[in-house]
């Protein structure tokens, strides 16, 4: 049965989703556990500059000591404003001067990267010692590079497209994910439903998505259920300001008892049948509909508590 | 449609073994979380365990009663599920169903009977 | 464990009756779902999540209920309605299955 919801852009007013993801349009992990110094390169796309980027590497201690020193190559189409955080990292920075500007005074070795295409680079930076991570992101808002963490099975790092970089590298988009909405055909009264998909990764293994839902309406105002559809290795930790119907894939459980693991159900895994579960659920507004890549992190702030709905 | 045929069940003696089987078909076995649920005579039922798919790394859960005792496995290319049952007990003595969770156990084999007795 | 208590554990009532089945739980859950079983036969999927009756189930059976209190009713017994029925919560690990209620002919 055709459930009729035209499904239209939802002003940013209405409700916005911003994630982090370790998806990648290009990437590779490799491991290199003997080098001297571990290389991690960035390929960084704009669309349009100047642009700011929040970068922060993140060392995990071994055998009770930092690791071993890093070189980050970072290659950037347009004018970046980087904050960088890298606290106690011994860290060698290689960039383009005149496209990045650094808000405060970075701290750290730094080295001239010539003007080179990609796979030049790629060999560049290899010839510096053995490749750790690649990647390659299209405006990134912020990045999280996480040290001594490569779990990779190459012992090469060869940029292969649409890759998980798994929790070498997160990082988020800059534009938030698109949010549509519509009215359920049909179904009176005044409940809301926010439904989220996440496509399939490129990587398999068990994922914890926690998703941040934030609702700003008067606790007794809301009747909403919150549709969390996903591949069966995903399971989710919800942290919502409001407490609303839940209506899960895999498992779930709240950020205030994470230990209390909640069955969910086979849901469909199409937009149409999503709209159907919805209804089923007798909502009569679907407030926002988001697909997402794989992703760690899901934030979505809505103001429509059951509220007239309005498109862009 | 949706079949689920248990086999493997018969008299054993106190502390031997017994391997079930549950043949699936009718729907895609490979992306489905099996379960266990077994019935003792004249009594309710109880859950015994589950296996996850490929997926979620075959990841198997168990009841506190059967832990240690018993395993869950699953063999996709055949689309079986088994339950190899080890140090049985009196008490272990009961109809064995094999189950498929959607919304709920929504699919469920005839069941097969384990009889532990000296 | 989260104990699910039911009551009656068996009652009689006639055709035509209306019939209601608690279930409580030692502890909060999201959902109650619900099974039917007749004698020799395996239990069928009756009522998930609390309320939504499974493919084929009659409408005179509704299920509600929130937090630890969850109900099954049938509005108007019918014969084909004699049977045990559970109550089954996934809300926490383990799964814990209610103790059944008979509901035989007066």
């Known amino acids: 049965e055709t459930v009729h919801c035209d499904l239209q852009p939802v002003g940013p007013e209405r409700g916005e989703v911003t994630y982090t993801t370790s998806q990648v349009s290009k990437g590779c992990v490799a491991q290199a556990p003997n080098a001297i110094l571990e290389v991690h390169v960035l390929f960084l796309e704009f669309p349009t500059g100047p642009s700011q980027l929040e970068l922060t590497l993140q060392a995990s201690k071994q055998n009770g000591t930092w690791p071993r020193e890093v070189l980050l190559v970072l290659s950037v189409n347009s004018s970046v404003f980087l904050h960088l955080q890298a606290l106690g990292i011994p860290l060698h920075l290689a960039y383009n001067s005149s496209l990045v500007t650094f808000q405060e005074p970075p701290g750290v070795n730094t080295t001239e990267l010539p003007s080179f295409p990609k796979t030049q680079i790629l060999e560049w930076a290899a010839e510096r010692g053995p490749i750790t991570s690649a990647a390659e992101l299209n405006d990134p808002q912020s990045i999280l590079l996480r040290l001594g963490q490569a779990q990779g099975s190459l012992s090469f790092c060869m940029l292969e497209a649409s890759q998980d970089m798994g929790r070498t590298l997160e990082w988020r988009p800059r534009t938030p994910a698109l949010v549509r909405g519509c009215h359920l055909e049909g179904v009176a009264g005044h409940k809301e439903a926010h439904i989220l998909r996440v496509l399939p990764g490129h990587s398999a293994g068990p994922r914890t998505v926690t998703v941040k839902v934030e609702l700003s309406c008067a606790p007794g105002d809301l009747d909403a259920v919150l549709i969390l559809q996903g591949p069966p290795y995903v399971s989710w930790l919800i942290d919502a300001n409001h407490n609303m119907q839940i209506w899960t894939t895999g498992e779930y459980s709240f950020k205030i008892f994470p230990e209390k693991n909640i069955r969910g159900f086979k849901l469909p895994d199409t937009p149409q049948g999503l709209l159907g579960e919805a209804r089923m659920l007798n909502a009569s507004i679907v407030a926002s509909f988001v697909e997402l890549p794989l992703a760690s992190i899901v934030s979505l702030h809505a103001s429509s508590c059951g509220g007239r709905l309005q498109t862009s | 449609e949706v079949q689920l045929v248990e086999s493997g069940g018969g008299l054993v003696k106190p502390g031997g073994s017994l391997r079930l089987s549950c043949a699936a078909s009718?729907?895609?076995?490979?992306?489905?979380?099996m379960d266990w649920v077994r019935q003792a005579p004249g009594k309710g039922l109880e859950w015994v365990g589950e296996i996850r798919s490929k997926a979620s790394n075959h990841a198997t859960y168990y009841a506190e009663s059967v832990k240690g005792r018993f395993t869950i496995s699953r063999d996709d290319s055949k689309n079986t599920l088994y339950l190899q049952m080890n140090s049985l007990k009196t008490e272990d003595t009961a109809v064995y169903y094999c189950?498929?969770?959607?919304?709920?156990?929504?699919?469920w084999g005839q069941g097969t009977l384990v009889t532990v007795s000296s | 464990d989260i104990q699910l208590t039911q009551s009656p554990s068996s009652l009689s009532a006639s055709v035509g009756d209306r019939v209601t089945i608690t279930c409580r739980a030692s502890?909060?859950?999201?959902?109650m779902h619900w099974y039917q079983q007749k004698p020799g036969k395996a239990p069928k999927p009756w009522i998930y999540a609390t309320s939504n009756l499974a493919s084929g189930v009659p409408s005179r059976f509704s299920g509600s209920g929130s937090g630890t209190d969850y109900t099954l009713t049938i509005s108007s017994l019918q014969p084909e309605d004699f049977a045990t029925y559970y109550c089954?919560?996934?809300?926490?690990?383990?799964?814990?299955f209610g103790g059944g209620t008979k509901v035989e002919i007066k």
């Open positions: 089954q919560q996934w809300s926490s690990n383990p799964l814990t």
């Open positions: 009718g729907f895609t076995f490979s992306d489905a979380w």
């Open positions: 189950t498929t969770w959607r919304r709920f156990f929504d699919s």
């Open positions: 502890s909060s859950v999201s959902y």
